[in-house]
Interface confidence: low
């Protein structure tokens, strides 16, 4: 049979010749009656055979990382019989490790981000070399890790290539860190090779920052003239920290939010100083108030950073504007009885420059020709007035400041003209009527009613009669019927139209006034042919329109 | 190894005070690393977040209580303590204090809870 | 205020088994997310913070995973200790919110 150790090569062998090891029939008597053959992949070029010993060679040199074992096939021939001395067989040569390859990180380039003050021992990433050695053979593909540059913020796990935070760190002081990583085979023992590496470590910002101004004190001016809403200036807080960790609100302390406000821009994260309420200088020309800030977005676990909020002082100057005249009321109403003479009383009205100077007001009355308004504002009739005519006037006083006409203030006056009992009352009509020759006594010929100019502060009430003469005369009567009305009614039974066709009636009617007028009215009254049904009349006035609403034939 | 306590009657009557102490040992309640909280949890349900306090005395409530709850801390005692005014029936649970870490937010140290029932 | 809502609220799963309980935000919470462990007539002890990080002392057997608003714990291989009711929590703003709980049994 065969006879054979296990064949090692060690790679990188630079000799021109290496002897493996030998094969050989354990028929071989060492007389050269056998021949030794090679066959398979590398026989012959890798891998020779000294066909007399059976000894083999490496004659190239071998990259075991390249190649680590090849299977070659024996033969054993008797060079007498040309025959096989052995059954051909299969054998491995294989070629052992030398460390001759560096560790090499294969991942490159490496980039990390880990936030700011991180506890030690975050972890902030994981670093992998690769060693082609045979892993299998002694320390060759042991790799310990190490950390060249980066102390004392990281450190590296040896084994794993794990590389966690050692020390906290602020972004605000330093950004970014490069790490250098050095990976050694042979566990780090002499002789040993090395790869490094780097490592960018990015620190992302953590709200550790509050918001700070720069300045401890504001000065600021508003114009009194100055609506609300107005911007009237900025203040500005910085913050060291980045993106929404630097995003803040400004805000004025409670006791200060009265006549301002701040509100935020958030895109320069700026306080705009805000007028809430409109300011007068000369009630109060100066105010302080005082200013927070604050971040806008911060975790709960984050506010130990944020406990005491930065404020500024805000001084505010009142600047004064020139104001027009003020009057004392928003509008006046006065009252004045009619028929009073010219130049009466009618009221004083009253307008002060509100700024300091205290210019004197000139007043005047705008669109009237009944009403004077002196230098002091008292106002008095250039007219008699009628309340019948016009009982309401709706005017427009106007005050000036004497040293700047520009200034001007107008308000309404209303003035209403108070009823005197000037006006008698008088028929509500013309009242034209007739009666019947046949007429009985006691016949309702009209009904009359009266109005009266004057206004009545009670009910208007009239009280009607007939004159002297016609009371003497005793064709008619009248009845008050206490309602404003009264009735004439016949005295007698039978009119003669021939005789006498028209009868002319004074009556008189009184108001309840103080004092009380009476006016005299006439009442025509034509005596008229009704004919025995009535229906047909003849009057001495043919187109005569009766109140009963038809012609006469 | 840092522990905590809570310490106050089981048995508090409707419409009165209910007054919890949380003893901290084995470390100071000072430390600028942790906050001090109060969490409860009614009977068979989940845990309820009442509040915290930092040592400085700056406090953190849920709205749901509605302003009834007060945290308080006295460092000299190395104690903090909660006050819930005007309870109810609903107040009926386990009151437990644990230590939250200012960087996570998380409760890494709890005392063994006390329960408190209220009822007349 | 943020909601955190747990799923499922009870299971069972035999020994040896990998068991996932999920924990959803109603908004982003970034990696402000906590999970603890409560044995009956026990008080919560904490498993996980910030995510994924492990409590000192924790079996590595428990691992948390996420970010935003949908978070995961993870125990690689049941046994019957881990018969308990885990709860997650947010420590991103207050009121810090806790999860409903699940509850994991062994079948």
């Known amino acids: 049979g065969w006879v054979w150790n296990q064949f090692f090569v060690p790679e990188e062998m630079n000799t021109t010749s290496h002897h493996i090891g030998q094969l050989r029939s354990d028929l071989d008597n060492g007389n050269n009656s056998f021949q030794y053959k090679l066959l398979g992949a590398g026989a012959g070029s890798t891998f020779i055979i000294d066909e007399r010993t059976g000894d083999i060679y490496a004659i190239q040199k071998l990259d075991r990382e390249e190649r680590s074992l090849y299977i070659l096939r024996a033969q054993v021939i008797d060079i007498a019989t040309g025959r096989a001395v052995e059954p051909e067989s299969e054998f491995v040569i294989k070629v052992s490790d030398i460390n001759d390859n560096e560790p090499k990180f294969l991942d490159e380039p490496y980039e990390a981000i880990v936030p700011e003050m991180s506890p030690e021992g975050t972890l902030v990433i994981q670093v992998t070399a690769s060693d082609a050695d045979d892993p299998s053979s002694g320390n060759n593909a042991r790799l310990l890790y190490s950390l060249l540059q980066g102390q004392p913020y990281f450190s590296v796990e040896p084994t794993t290539g794990v590389i966690r935070i050692s020390s906290k760190m602020d972004r605000e002081l330093q950004d970014e860190y490069w790490v250098i990583i050095q990976a050694k085979d042979m566990i780090g023992q002499p002789g040993a090779l090395s790869g490094t590496t780097s490592v960018l470590i990015k620190l992302s910002d953590v709200n550790d920052n509050k918001p700070i101004f720069k300045e401890s004190l504001y000065r600021l001016t508003v114009s009194e003239s100055a609506p609300t809403g107005t911007s009237i200036g900025t203040i500005m807080a910085y913050d060291n920290d980045i993106g929404e960790n630097a995003e803040m609100d400004y805000s004025i302390e409670e006791d200060d939010s009265q006549t301002f406000d701040i509100i935020t821009n958030h895109e320069t994260q700026e306080g705009i100083v805000i007028l809430k309420k409109k300011v007068d200088f000369e009630h109060q020309n100066h105010y302080g108030i005082r200013a927070k800030v604050k971040n806008h977005h911060v975790p709960e676990q984050l506010m130990k950073y944020h406990t005491e909020a930065s404020t500024t002082f805000i001084k505010i100057q009142v600047e004064d504007v020139d104001e027009p005249p003020l009057f004392l009321l928003p509008y006046y109403v006065f009252e004045v009885f009619e028929e009073t003479p010219q130049g009466s009383f009618v009221g004083v009205v009253s307008a002060t420059d509100p700024d300091n100077r205290k210019s004197p007001i000139r007043y005047s009355i705008t669109r009237s020709k009944v009403f004077n308004i002196n230098d002091n504002g008292t106002i008095t009739t250039s007219n008699s007035l009628d309340r019948e005519i016009s009982a309401w006037y709706n005017l427009s006083i106007t005050a000036t400041e004497k040293y700047n006409i520009e200034q001007i203030s107008s308000i309404p006056l209303y003035v209403q003209v108070l009823n005197i009992n000037d006006h008698a009352p008088e028929f509500s009509q013309y009242y034209e009527t007739y009666v019947c020759e046949n007429a009985g006594s006691g016949q309702v010929i009209q009904t009359i009613s009266a109005v009266d100019r004057d206004e009545s502060i009670e009910e208007h009430h009239f009280y009607f009669n007939l004159s002297v003469e016609d009371t003497n005369n005793s064709s008619f009567t009248i009845i008050d019927n206490q309602d404003n009305t009264a009735v004439i009614l016949t005295n007698r039974t039978g009119f003669n139209l021939q005789e006498e066709p028209v009868f002319y009636i004074s009556i008189l009617i009184a108001d309840n006034g103080i004092p009380s007028l009476t006016s005299t009215n006439t009442l025509t009254i034509h005596v008229c042919d009704c004919g025995d049904s009535g229906s047909t009349q003849t009057c001495q006035y043919q187109e005569l329109v009766l109140s009963m609403g038809f012609k006469t034939e | 190894q840092v522990q905590l306590q809570e310490s106050g009657p089981g048995l508090v009557k409707p419409s009165q005070t209910l007054s919890l102490t949380c003893t901290v040992s084995g470390g100071s309640i000072s430390s600028n690393d942790y906050y001090w909280s109060w969490i409860r949890q009614h009977p068979g349900k989940g845990l309820e977040w009442i509040g915290y306090i930092y040592y400085s005395g700056s406090t953190f409530y849920n709205p749901s209580l509605k302003s009834r709850g007060a945290i308080s801390v006295d460092t000299s005692k190395n104690q903090f303590s909660l006050k819930l005014t005007s309870v109810t029936a609903a107040d009926t649970a386990v009151y437990y204090c644990a230590r939250g870490v200012y960087r996570t937010g998380a409760f890494d140290i709890w005392g063994q809870g006390t329960m408190v029932t209220v009822s007349s | 205020d943020i909601q955190m809502t747990q799923s499922p609220s009870s299971l069972s799963a035999s020994v040896g088994d990998r068991v996932t309980i999920t924990c959803r935000a109603s908004q982003s919470i970034s990696s402000y997310l906590n999970w603890y462990q409560q044995k009956p007539g026990k008080a919560p002890k904490s498993l996980i913070y910030a995510a994924s990080s492990l409590q000192s002392g924790v079996p590595s057997k428990f691992s948390g995973s996420g970010s935003g608003t949908d978070f995961t714990l993870t125990i690689s291989s049941l046994q019957p200790e881990d018969i308990a009711t885990y709860y997650c929590?947010?420590?991103?703003?207050?009121?810090?919110?806790f999860g409903g709980g699940t509850k994991v049994d062994i079948k």
């Open positions: 929590q947010q420590s991103y703003s207050t009121p810090q919110a």
